[in-house]
């Protein structure tokens, strides 16, 4: 079936090796010759020619294909010129001949036993495979093609991606490095607890791929979608040469959704216990799972063992707020935390949602800060608050919000990083509500916002200014 892969080979006598320990040669004849007409003879330098046993297969509308599989592994030698020629037994003619090096005619069998599963991040796909000839896998490079699987359209998209797979593992990376510090002190980084804007995927699904002999990681896919994928391999062109082998049979995989869609938020108050919460879905039950990993890299032949996240009572503090499911587990500060939420709908369908991985020090939630105020002069307020965490004062940022009584909209102010207070000028003879919240956003610790402090009611009298 792989003959088409050798189409670019202009030699009438085409040869290929699957493992570089075998050799198959074939050629086609239009002429209707008797069986036994041809002999395929071969010889290495200074050796006596030998005949390779031929089989033939009739090809409709064309003629006959003659095929020889070298019978003995010892007859297949690398780095020596092999002289081949086809002799006609009945007529005095050498039908065709060529000289080749077995090490330059590789046509590897496709990788087999492909396993595919969601990676550690939403939109990631972890795949691993077995090489039919492991002894040559170091001398092969791989190519992957994949695309979204549309059950309504079995042919899939017209554009499929072909991605050369040179190396495995993106550079060992901490999930979500605190690049947010480059912006304003309290700018929102993309965090596992952050319900940020959905990224729209371009039609050509731009994605990154990295690979190793037996595993690779694709990122940039659409969480919650189904994908098909295929692999093929080719000699690396350095130690061994040849052509791309055929594609493996397609494998399909359903990627978990992005837990952002469930409003997943995880935090720790004590750097030991982690609590995760997400919106409870209507007519569905849900369960949280977690696992710890040491390093974020392609886990070769290693699939995570998800542990149960211990369920807490469901909370529903107000009618407007959606009901939350919560769970908690003990964590460690030396490993990355991965969260998975499984939602089971009434008919029993299970949907998985993956959170973005994080270190425990990236999910530290501060206690609600206390806000104190006093009026210095008419309408001129002096504000003061205690740092909820004296050990991270320089990494704590605050938001102060206030609104006039009877108003719906809040005005939000961000004091400088590490500030312990400030002044506020308000309109005369007016009533206000003030609230404060805090979060960690430094090089050592980060985390979600604390809850807003209880509203502080103030009556004042002048215009607003810091």
């Amino acid at each position: 079936q792989d003959v088409s892969l050798l189409a670019s080979d202009s030699e009438p006598l085409k040869c290929f090796s699957r493992t570089f320990e075998d050799l198959t040669c074939f050629w086609d004849e239009e002429e209707a010759a008797p069986s036994g007409t041809y002999q395929l003879l071969y010889a290495y330098p200074r050796e006596k020619p030998r005949a390779c046993p031929l089989s033939s297969q009739s090809m409709p509308h064309f003629g006959t294909r003659y095929v020889c599989q070298f019978p003995d592994q010892e007859e297949v030698r690398l780095f020596f010129p092999l002289h081949l020629w086809v002799k006609n037994v009945f007529l005095n003619q050498t039908r065709t001949q060529r000289v080749l090096f077995v090490d330059s005619v590789g046509l590897p069998a496709p990788p087999s036993i492909i396993k595919a599963m969601g990676g550690s991040q939403p939109g990631e796909l972890q795949i691993s495979w077995e090489e039919p000839a492991p002894e040559i896998s170091d001398f092969l490079r791989y190519e992957l093609r994949y695309g979204p699987r549309d059950p309504k359209n079995s042919t899939g998209p017209t554009v499929i991606q072909l991605i050369a797979t040179e190396t495995c593992c993106p550079a060992l990376q901490r999930p979500h490095s605190a690049s947010a510090l480059d912006q304003s002190p309290c700018a929102q980084p993309t965090m596992p607890w952050q319900d940020g804007p959905k990224q729209t995927s371009p039609s050509r699904e731009a994605s990154a791929l990295t690979a190793e002999g037996g595993s690779c990681l694709i990122s940039g896919l659409q969480p919650g979608n189904s994908y098909w994928l295929q692999l093929r391999s080719e000699p690396d062109g350095i130690s061994l040469g040849g052509s791309w082998g055929s594609w493996s049979l397609p494998v399909t995989v359903d990627l978990p959704g992005d837990a952002v869609a469930l409003g997943l938020q995880c935090f720790t108050l004590d750097l030991k216990n982690v609590t995760c919460q997400w919106q409870q879905q209507d007519h569905a039950s849900s369960q949280g799972f977690f696992y710890h990993s040491r390093a974020r890299c392609c886990p070769r032949d290693r699939y995570p063992i998800w542990e149960n996240c211990e369920e807490e009572e469901k909370t529903n503090p107000g009618l407007q707020t959606p009901q939350f499911s919560r769970c908690h587990f003990k964590s460690r500060n030396d490993s990355i935390i991965h969260i998975l939420v499984e939602v089971t709908t009434a008919p029993g369908t299970v949907h998985s949602y993956l959170g973005s991985p994080f270190w425990i020090h990236q999910a530290v939630r501060l206690p609600t800060p206390n806000l104190h105020w006093r009026e210095i002069s008419s309408g001129h307020l002096e504000l003061e608050w205690q740092h909820p965490s004296s050990w991270a004062a320089q990494e704590t940022c605050y938001q102060l919000r206030y609104t006039g009584e009877g108003h719906q909209d809040w005005k939000v102010l961000e004091p400088p990083l590490g500030a312990r207070g400030g002044t506020l000028e308000l309109r005369p003879r007016s009533r206000y509500r003030l609230q404060l919240r805090a979060r960690l956003n430094g090089p050592t610790y980060q985390g979600p916002w604390s809850s807003w402090s209880d509203p502080t009611r103030v009556e004042t009298a002048t215009e607003t200014a810091w």
């Epitope: 009945f90 007529l91 005095n92």
Partner: antibody, heavy 118, light 107 residues
Framework: DVQLQESGPGLVKPSQSLSLTCTVT?????????WNWIRQFPGNKLEWMGY???????SYNPSLKSRNSITRDTSKNQFFLQLNSVTTEDTATYYC???????????WGQGTSVTVSS | DIQMTQSSSSFSVSLGDRVTITCMAS??????LAWYQQKPGNAPRLLIS???SLETGVPSRFSGSGSGKDYTLSITSLQTEDVGTYYC?????????FGGGTKLEIN
Amino acid sequence: DVQLQESGPGLVKPSQSLSLTCTVTGYSITSDYTWNWIRQFPGNKLEWMGYITYSGSTSYNPSLKSRNSITRDTSKNQFFLQLNSVTTEDTATYYCARLGRRYTMDYWGQGTSVTVSS
Amino acid sequence: DIQMTQSSSSFSVSLGDRVTITCMASEDIYIRLAWYQQKPGNAPRLLISAATSLETGVPSRFSGSGSGKDYTLSITSLQTEDVGTYYCQQYWSSPWTFGGGTKLEIN
């Protein structure tokens, strides 16, 4: 033009050997092609007996149970059929023929009739 | 060995008739089939190779067809000189074998 001519005894006694010669003119039998012996029994049934190729390799019809051999004399541009231990069943007209480019018998001799009888 | 069967051993035909002679192999011979014509007192003469290829000098009223195990020789308009016995021969597998022959006679 290529011509083939069979020659040999018209009568052979049972259990003896039958020897026939095919003389080829107009083409060297060592240059190319494959040179065949075919016989036709009195009921008109045709039987392929064997060949010798331009290079001297031979092949025979297994039905003759190793009784026949085909050889050649390249200096005379002739090839031969020897059939041992003949019986009356071997009475036939013997033809020599060339296997041509299309692997079919494109040139035939006119045939020589052989009777096996005591 | 591959058996070649020509179902009719003889035909009585009229000049100008269309004649069809059939030949069946005991197994697939992949169009390795030749047709020969033999007139009384003469050696066989090659008409067709590879089931359908007409030899040089053979009149175009002769044609061959078929594949697999079943083959046919057709003569569109029978002439006097076409009288004789027709043989099929397979050359796919050794030993090469001939059909029993089909004799054409004029009514």
